[in-house]
């Protein structure tokens, strides 16, 4: 009867509905390709229910399979900007713990100014996800153009 | 025991599995940038389980966090078409009630003929989502090229 | 009390959480536009929980509405490669049983080297999904660049 009892007694978070949607805070200092994220109702439509932010990077609190999604739009961009500054690449990966470091999702901008994708991937409690933007172009901080999120799907 | 009892007694919709996938019906008349959608099994693979259509726009019936996704492909399009008619932009937002009006998701076509993205966002009962396509180009009505949908994820 | 009892007694798979994320194995022989997929923990971060592979194609085991997602990146690609070899198109569809054959999702590369999209669609037990890549360009087999997956969402 464990599963039904868990549902009756435990709060929503313990049903495994961990979810987060983040907006861009800022880019990293020179030599740091990471994007730094922020989330919370005071900021608009971003939120964290379960996962946490650790110095702008997303840390997972529950083991499971997650849907990870991202959209990044380059600021002040046209197709000629994008091609002139090629390669500009966005990679989402597990950056810590180091033993689990791996690239999960990678896209190049080529002649476009926006990349958007999503994938299912197993994540473990304590995994920190980093989003690395290589190249010299700046991402837009508009909340409808650049965002990053995860959704717990199943154990 | 409230949660378990609710599960036993209430129909599927009340478990919070609201979901919709829509196909393009038509574009708006002059000066109306909105796309008008339709859904239902008679039309093919589109459906509405929970949300409703209000004059071709999607109205939410349950509060919660939703995954919103969209793909729009321009008809008779090549990379030169897209760049010649730039800027052609697609924006998904809450258009009513006016007090909650906000852009949720925005993409430009630049030199591409298809945009596709998805994001998590809180939506409330009564929110109506509009999809605005700026510019003069027509979207494809092929059901595998242009579609729009939402999926309830959690309260 | 059937629903609560089912939850207590049945394994996770019977709760309807079918999910799969696949990585590219190889392309088809000449005249076969299909991509052939593989999945399993020994291969990295790909997995099948419920659906199965049948000669590299994904077969559904549970009726329901699914979120289908895909990303395909062309190998050794630049925007000029992509435009020179246009049209290169990726289509995801039900390829068997023949009576249910239909294209679900279609994207062209135009001047880009990656396509990524997702959609909700009803699928039935026994449906086999095929991913057809037309043209002469090869997809990347990097697991962070090319992947294909499904997630059961609701009955």
């Amino acid at each position: 009867q464990r599963f039904a009892q868990a549902q009756q007694q435990l709060p929503l978070e313990s049903l495994g509905w961990d979810v987060a949607e983040l907006q861009l805070n800022h880019t990293g200092p020179q030599q740091d390709p990471r994007l730094y994220w922020q989330g919370g109702p005071a900021l608009g439509r971003s939120f964290l229910h379960g996962p946490e932010l650790d110095k702008g990077q997303l840390r997972i609190h529950r083991d499971g399979i997650y849907m990870v999604h991202i959209q990044v739009t380059l600021a002040i961009c046209s197709s000629t900007t994008a091609s002139r500054h090629h390669p500009t690449t966005l990679a989402v990966g597990i950056c810590s713990p180091a033993s689990r470091s791996i690239s999960l999702l990678r896209l190049s901008f080529h002649q476009g100014c926006t990349i958007a994708s999503q994938r299912l991937t197993p994540l473990a409690r304590g995994d920190t996800l980093c989003t690395n933007l290589t190249g010299t172009l700046l991402p837009s901080r508009n909340t409808d153009e650049t965002f990053f999120g995860v959704q717990w799907v199943r154990p | 025991q409230r949660f378990a009892q609710a599960q036993q007694q209430l129909p599927l919709e009340s478990l919070g599995w609201d979901v919709a996938e829509l196909q393009l019906n038509h574009t708006g008349p002059q000066q109306d940038p909105r796309l008008y959608w339709q859904g239902g099994p008679a039309l093919g693979r589109s459906f509405l389980h929970g949300p409703e259509l209000d004059k071709g726009q999607l109205r939410i019936h349950r509060d919660g966090i939703y995954m919103v996704h969209i793909q729009v492909t321009l008809a008779i399009c090549s990379s030169t078409t897209a760049s010649r008619h730039h800027p052609t932009t697609l924006a998904v937002g809450i258009c009513s009630p006016a007090s909650r009006s906000i852009s949720l998701l925005r993409l430009s076509f630049h030199q591409g003929c298809t945009i596709a993205s998805q994001r998590l966002t809180p939506l409330a009962r009564g929110d109506t989502l509009c999809t605005n396509l700026t510019g003069t180009l027509l979207p494809s009505r092929n059901t595998d090229e242009t579609f729009f949908g939402v999926q309830w994820v959690r309260p | 009390q059937r629903f609560a009892q089912a939850q207590q007694q049945l394994p996770l798979e019977s709760l309807g959480w079918d999910v799969a994320e696949l990585q590219l194995n190889h392309t088809g022989p000449q005249q076969d536009p299909r991509l052939y997929w593989q999945g399993g923990p020994a291969l990295g971060r790909s997995f099948l929980h419920g659906p199965e592979l049948d000669k590299g194609q994904l077969r559904i085991h549970r009726d329901g509405i699914y979120m289908v997602h895909i990303q395909v990146t062309l190998a050794i690609c630049s925007s000029t490669t992509a435009s020179r070899h246009h049209p290169t198109t990726l289509a995801v569809g039900i390829c068997s049983p023949a009576s249910r054959s239909i294209s679900l999702l279609r994207l062209s590369f135009h001047q880009g080297c990656t396509i990524a999209s997702q959609r909700l669609t009803p699928l039935a037990r026994g449906d086999t999904l095929c991913t057809n890549l037309t043209g002469t360009l090869l997809p990347s087999r990097n697991t962070d660049e090319t992947f294909f997956g499904v997630q059961w969402v609701r009955p």
């Epitope: - | 574009t27 039309l43 009505r141 | -």
Partner: nanobody, 118 residues
Framework: QLQLVESGGGLVQLGGSLTLSCTAS????????VGWYRQAPGSDRELVAL??????NYADSVEGRFTISRDNAKNTVYLQMNSLKPEDTAVYYC?????????????WGQGTQVTVSS
């Protein structure tokens, strides 16, 4: 049942102009997708111009030379073709794609031949 009849085709010199007409037996709605397709011998049918609700798209091969327009009062759609080239030689078909409660429905004309001589 919408019937479509094309007219205006013929033989024209390189660089010349023609206007094709497509007259419908009933109302063509603003929200209908109305297109002109063409098919050259040994080739697939190609969509060259499309209009609906004041939006218009053209194939690269005809952009700037062809113009699609409609006269709602006459239930007629036109294709003005300028600076014609030999590669424009084809049978031109009018198409109305109408969304119904059972999905899209296509209506076709019988076609009109356009031949461009050099």
């Amino acid at each position: 049942q919408l019937q479509l009849v094309e007219s205006g085709g013929g033989l024209v010199q390189l660089g010349g102009s023609l206007t094709l007409s497509c007259t419908a037996s009933g109302i063509i709605f603003n929200s209908d997708y109305v297109g002109w397709y063409r098919q050259a011998p040994g080739s697939d049918r190609e969509l060259v111009a499309l209009t609906s609700n004041m939006r218009t798209n053209y194939a690269d091969s005809v952009e700037g030379r062809f113009t699609i327009s409609r006269d709602n009062a006459k239930n007629t759609v036109y294709l003005q073709m300028n600076s014609l080239k030999p590669e424009d030689t084809a049978v031109y078909y009018c198409n109305v794609n109408r969304m119904t409660s059972y999905g899209p429905r296509d209506y076709w004309g019988q076609g009109t031949q356009v031949t461009v001589s050099s």
